[in-house]
Amino acid sequence: DNKGYCAQYRGEVCNAVLAKDALVFLNTSYADPEEAQELLVHTAWNELKVVSPVCRPAAEALLCNHIFQECSPGVVPTPIPICREYCLAVKELFCAKEWLVMEEKTHRGLYRSEMHLLSVPECSKLPSMHWDPTACARL
């Protein structure tokens, strides 16, 4: 699951969100990691066009940093997940109304593909910035 390599982000969708020259984790479980991850972001990004101005920038940051995780280079390149705190804040503060709608649609099977689910992290499974500040990315 966590097999991949570090590379500079060269896509377009997350250009404004990710730090310039950021090293991101590209997952080799995809045949073409760059293209596959960019497509994931692009698909989810289009859905964000209709969300509130409070939600949108927070959701974009969450999305980009979840799909293109910060990469810690080394003998074994490691993705650094988003901190649970930021994920929760996006889900239940910045985007509370939108998140409810999305969960409702998911339960009712209104999404045509499961792609959007891959782009939404499960907050409870993410590390906390209070337990080990180096284990996750603070946005």
Epitope: R84, L88, A89, E92, L93, C123, W131
Partner: antibody, heavy 118, light 107 residues
Framework: QVQLQESGPGLVKPSQTLSLTCTVS??????????WNWIRQHPGKGLEWIGY???????YYNPSLKSRVTISVDTSKNQFSLKLSSVTAADTAVYYC??????????WGQGTLVTVSS | DIQLTQSPSFLSASVGDRVTITCRAS??????LAWYQQKPGKAPKLLIF???ALQSGVPSRFSGSGSGTEFTLTISSLQPEDFATYHC?????????FGQGTKVEIK
Amino acid sequence: QVQLQESGPGLVKPSQTLSLTCTVSGGSISSGGHYWNWIRQHPGKGLEWIGYIYYSGTTYYNPSLKSRVTISVDTSKNQFSLKLSSVTAADTAVYYCAREVGIAFDYWGQGTLVTVSS
Amino acid sequence: DIQLTQSPSFLSASVGDRVTITCRASQGVSSYLAWYQQKPGKAPKLLIFAASALQSGVPSRFSGSGSGTEFTLTISSLQPEDFATYHCQQLNSYPPTFGQGTKVEIK
């Protein structure tokens, strides 16, 4: 809508242990990755964070109270509890339970006044 | 621990006034700062999170700004129901800490 409700004795004798329980309704303590907190407010003063518990049992306490505080969780009852030992008059306060949603406390109990007096 | 200092501690104002409360942190807290409103005998209520984001259901006359060590809460036109105590709080690093509170009273 998540609701929190504190319960426990309103009067505790000095040197004894203060025990409070917070019951959560409208949501599960075990889901979502939230921290469940205790906060207190001395009469006419500001707010003081006591500590939190995660559904797994992981705790984090305010260093200033750490030696006297124990927070526990009972997921089957959807409750978490506070025990504060060796209390003095300085522990007289309104005690609140609250849910932390990453970067803020979004849901609070109504608070319960605990008086330490013989 | 990070100390938060609110100013002023007390503020007398009239309905319709523009009110500004400042919160200064002893060290940088990024944008991990929240504001709460508390009425007598009630629990605090979340108004602003992440320094400037308005909590759902909070009137737009409330706004927050700042980052790092200096933050402000502004009420653009004070309403009768806004007379209360306001607290700032940081969650950038543990333990979470609160300001001492600012009581907004009727002039």
